[in-house]
Interface confidence: low
């Protein structure tokens, strides 16, 4: 039995971040779960992990670089972007393990979401006069 | 005396509602989350809700999802278990408990009530 994850097709990060909610067909509520983001087709860069049991408060890191936030709900967690590079143009794919009560379960493969980073665009300083010539 | 005491159970009719409180003395509930359980005779112990105390964010089982609904009133130190649409298979003694997060696995709480018994019956 598998869980299955819905996301957005795309998102597009135009300062640089993003939030990116895996919506899941599973109650997370009174569980131990791993909840995790993939980047690329082949899901080789794990992005950011939200893990929760009662024992501690709820963790959200990331091993690869990414700055990072997680947010909890009954049946979704929202992964937070920040300070994304232009370069980091992706599919990213939500992944989702439930540890405890048993049995153990996770999901689907999902459709995953292309994230599309826009590049900041520096607006030009206003043009003040400079010191006069004679 | 640091206690947690729950109220407003009852008998009730399938279809009915109820409003269980979960009240503390000699502490603050504002700086915890706070879970309602349920325990059914011959059946284990299960989370039904759960409130938050950062944010306020509320957990619901699937069992009692869009029926119940938890709130919370820090100025009357007291959390609100609303219970709407009840069923026979509600029936059970209910329990509040603080924790420091409203997910997980461990059930390590701080302060237990004593329990308020639900029954749903024609």
């Known amino acids: 039995n598998k869980i299955l994850v819905k996301q957005s097709p795309m998102l597009v990060a135009y300062d640089n971040a993003v939030n990116l909610s895996c919506k899941y067909s599973y109650n997370l509520f009174s569980r131990e779960f791993r909840a995790s983001l993939h980047k690329g087709l082949d899901s080789a860069v794990e992005v950011c992990v939200v893990y929760g049991n009662y024992s501690q408060q709820l963790q959200v890191y990331s091993k690869t670089g990414f700055n990072c936030d997680g947010k909890l709900g009954n049946e979704s967690v929202t992964f937070y972007l920040q300070n994304l590079y232009v370069n980091q143009t992706d599919i990213y794919f939500c992944k989702i393990e439930v540890m405890y009560p048993p049995p153990y379960l996770d999901n689907e493969k999902s459709n995953g979401t292309i994230i599309h980073v826009k590049g900041k665009h520096l607006c030009p300083s206003p043009l003040f006069p400079g010191p006069s010539k004679p | 005396e640091v206690q947690l005491v729950e109220s407003g159970g009852g008998l009730v009719q399938p279809g009915g509602s109820l409003r269980l409180s979960c009240a503390a003395s000699?502490?603050?509930?504002?700086?915890?989350?706070i879970h309602w359980f349920r325990q059914a005779p011959g059946k284990e112990r299960e989370g039904v809700s759960c409130?938050?105390?950062?944010?306020?964010?509320?957990y619901y089982a699937n069992s009692v999802k869009g029926r119940f609904t938890i709130s919370r009133d820090n100025a009357k130190n007291a959390v609100y278990l609303q219970m709407n649409s009840l069923k026979p298979e509600d029936t059970a003694v209910y329990y509040c408990?603080?924790?420091?997060?409203?997910?997980?696995?461990?059930?390590?709480?701080?302060?237990w009530g004593q329990g308020t018994q639900v029954t749903v019956s024609s």
């Open positions: 408990a603080t924790a420091k997060r409203c997910w997980g696995l461990s059930y390590e709480y701080d302060y």
């Open positions: 000699g502490f603050t509930l504002d700086a915890y989350a």
């Open positions: 409130i938050s105390s950062s944010d306020g964010s509320t």
